[in-house]
């Protein structure tokens, strides 16, 4: 059977616990025959705090007297240690150091809803570093009275396990909590509370909403709560939003109409209670319902921009292009586009429905006047048409913008800027940006972006779909009933040297001159907008400089004709082209030699 | 997480012996006091014995006193309660507990951290 001490005892006095500060008297004593084989004098017992050695003494027993002990448990430990042999362990002890517990702190009690127990919060002070147990009780009404003890490590809660009714709501109850360790007790200060004071209602349940003839402006909360309620607040807020709206209800009875709801938007509902108008306190807030307002028709007129395209002498092509409502505008899902088509004079009306696209693109007389009238559809109803007189927009030379430039403005910006037109200023109505990524061939599909400007404004920066490195056909019209000017230039946001030159694809003859035509380079290694075209020659095996002759860019010119070559003389020809911020490397060469005669 | 299996519960005739086993997961074993708590039928749990300090220092109930032994080997993360003199009153749930008491309450059920599963004790003849 095995024995901690069956060779001796170590005694400890005044007690096992003891307050910080106080000093311990350590007594390690041996039992009979349990000493040194030989001679009792040889005995050497040795005291140990945890694995230092404090005190030794020749023997069979040993007194030492320690101060100075830390917060918390110390191991004593006494050995004996005999001439030629290993130290024996005799006994050991611990000694508890801690201190008296402080006066408990803010003791509050709270009943979760009327079905719940009564349960109880307190500070406990500083830590006592002994075990200390916590008892509460509760008196009330007919000398009735509670007591419940905690013995966990760290105590600070109670639940009585009882529950307080609402038979009496004004009767008082009396808390308080008591903390006993082996240096002493404490009580709290009392805490008195009547029913009111103290059961926190469970959070709302079963939250609903309903929309009367799914309109939103006749909408109504419901929900479920405990049956003494009489305050409600309820809190909600779009799901993309951070903020909540509040509302402050009494005697709701499970049920709120929302007035100032916005149509087709996901909201989130939370609602919280309380049994009285100063007493108690709010319920948690409870589980949140999320729901979609209702659509209404749309708010807002379309943003609409038009192109024409001159295709024969009877017939042109006329592409609309409109912007997406806001969603506040649209107030719901846009199932379509209404596009109205109608010769003015004649009278005849087209109409179509575009679902998917925010364009559209037909052809017509060019003889007539033509008005267009586009609206956006949900299933509520139809936005107000945005009607427009479809004129040729750069007809009035005097109402054309002047001056006009385009700068890079940062990362992916272009600031264009403008003087009004010549004609008298006051007439123009607003200025339309419109740019588009410059393709050789002006293809029409390319999209086409826009911005309204107000009549005095002579600048607009432009961010929407603008990229690095690549070259913006830009046109401001200035709008003045139903006249148009417009000005046009070409701008980038970031440029570089493009990285390859034209290719020539042929050389061709022309009464003692040449006619050198090329490729475009292709649009991704053109790195902004071209400026020039430079056009080398040197004679084949000659180390003399090239000649070159440089040619503005135009998006349409890819021939260009050289009359001061020499004839029946070899050439190395080649080209390249620049933006602002350099000139490209060679593009292919080609040999080229003359066979008319010199001039 | 320490796990805790206790083993070696079964029926015994009133004067005899059983010995219990408790073993431990973890290595970390050996900072912790080890306890044996019994919980007999309709009645609180309540403190039989504990090991601290690697065997050094050991509290048992007065009502187990002389009779019970308890012991632990670190080497093998197991903690022992040798019970001889069995009596009736005896019987119970055998349960094991690892955690540090603080002060002296050692014999308080709420101070250790992790318990095993129980093993039943039966002294009957």
């Known amino acids: 059977k095995i024995d901690a001490c069956k060779r001796g005892d170590v005694t400890v006095k005044p007690s096992h616990v003891i307050l910080l500060g106080s000093t311990v008297n350590i007594t390690c004593s041996l039992k009979p025959r349990q000493g040194c084989f030989h001679y009792s004098r040889r005995n050497k017992l040795i005291l140990y705090k945890f694995d230092r050695r404090i005190n030794f003494h020749h023997g069979h027993s040993l007194n030492s007297q320690v101060t100075g002990l830390p917060l918390g448990t110390t191991l004593f430990v006494c050995k004996l240690a005999c001439i030629n042999s290993d130290e024996i362990q005799i006994c050991g002890a611990e000694i508890f150091v801690g201190v008296a517990p402080e006066q408990p702190q803010n003791l509050s009690c709270i009943q979760k809803g009327e079905q719940g127990t009564v349960a109880c919060t307190w500070e406990r002070g500083r830590d006592t570093h002994l075990y200390t147990e916590y008892t509460l009780q509760l008196s009330g009404p007919k000398n009735l009275t509670w007591q419940k003890q905690c013995k966990d490590i760290y105590c600070d809660y109670l639940d009585f396990g009882i529950n307080l009714t609402p038979e009496s709501p004004e009767s008082n109850f009396t808390a308080k909590v008591t903390a006993v360790n082996s240096l002493g007790s404490s009580s709290s200060l009392p805490s008195t509370f009547t029913f009111l004071d103290i059961v926190r209602p469970l959070p709302p349940w079963d939250i609903r909403i309903k929309f009367q003839k799914a309109s939103v402006s006749r909408c109504t909360l419901y929900w479920r709560d405990e049956g003494l309620v009489l305050l409600n607040r309820l809190r909600y807020r779009p799901s993309n939003s951070r903020l909540w709206n509040m509302v402050n209800v009494t005697k709701a009875k499970g049920r709120h109409d929302l007035l100032d709801l916005k149509p087709f938007t996901e909201y989130e509902f939370q609602i919280s209670s309380k049994l009285h108008l100063y007493k108690g306190s709010w319920s948690d807030w409870s589980e949140s319902l999320r729901a979609q307002t209702p659509e209404e028709e749309p708010t807002g007129m379309l943003d609409v921009w038009y192109m024409k395209r001159h295709i024969d002498y009877s017939r042109q092509q006329i592409s609309l292009f409109w912007k997406n409502l806001s969603v506040s505008e649209a107030r719901g899902k846009i199932l379509h586009y209404q596009v109205t088509l109608q010769e003015l004079t004649g009278g005849k009306a087209m109409t179509q429905n575009i679902t998917g696209h925010t364009s559209w693109t037909t052809v017509i007389p060019r003889t007539g006047n033509w008005a267009v009238a586009v609206s956006a559809a949900n299933s509520k109803g139809s936005s107000l048409p945005t009607r427009i007189n479809i004129m040729n927009l750069c007809e009035a030379g005097l109402l054309a913008p002047r001056q006009v430039s385009a700068n890079s403005e940062g990362m992916d910006n272009i600031l264009v800027t403008w003087q009004p037109p010549r004609k008298d200023p006051s007439a123009v109505q607003e200025y339309v940006v419109e740019w588009r990524e410059l393709h050789p061939g002006g293809d029409t599909q390319v999209p086409l972006n826009w911005l309204r400007s107000r009549p005095y404004n002579v600048s607009a920066l432009i961010s929407e779909n603008i990229k690095s490195y690549i070259c913006y056909e830009i046109r401001v019209y200035a709008l003045s009933g139903d006249q148009g000017g417009c000005s046009s230039i070409l701008g980038n946001s970031k440029h570089k040297a493009p990285l390859s030159g034209p290719h020539i694809n042929a050389i061709t003859e022309e009464k003692g001159s040449i006619l050198i035509s090329w490729n475009s380079i292709p649009v991704q290694e053109q790195m902004g907008c071209l400026l020039h075209y430079r056009i080398y020659w040197k004679e084949r095996d000659s180390n003399s400089q090239p000649q070159l002759c440089e040619i503005p860019y135009r998006v349409s010119q890819n021939s260009h004709p050289i009359n001061s070559l020499q004839p029946r003389v070899t050439y190395v020809l080649w080209m390249t082209a620049l933006t602002a911020a350099g000139e490209s490397s060679h593009g292919n060469e080609r040999e080229f030699c003359l066979q008319g005669k010199a001039n | 997480q320490v796990q805790l299996q206790e083993s070696g519960g079964g029926l015994v005739q009133p004067g005899g012996s059983l010995r219990l086993s408790c073993a431990a997961s973890?290595?970390?074993?050996?900072?912790?006091?080890m306890a044996w708590f019994r919980q007999a039928p309709g009645k609180e749990r309540e403190f039989v014995a504990v090991?601290?300090?690697?065997?050094?220092?050991?509290y048992y109930a007065d009502s187990v006193k002389g009779r019970f032994t308890i012991s632990r080997d670190d080497a093998k993360n197991t903690v022992y309660l040798q019970m001889d003199s069995l009596k009736p009153e005896d019987t119970a749930v055998y349960y094991c507990?690892?955690?540090?008491?603080?002060?002296?309450?050692?014999?308080?059920?709420?101070?250790?951290?992790?318990w095993g599963q129980g093993t039943q004790v039966t002294v009957s003849s």
């Open positions: 507990a690892a955690g540090d008491y603080r002060g002296n309450g050692y014999y308080v059920p709420g101070m250790y951290d992790y």
């Open positions: 973890r290595r970390t074993f050996s900072k912790h006091a």
């Open positions: 090991v601290r300090w690697s065997g050094i220092i050991t």
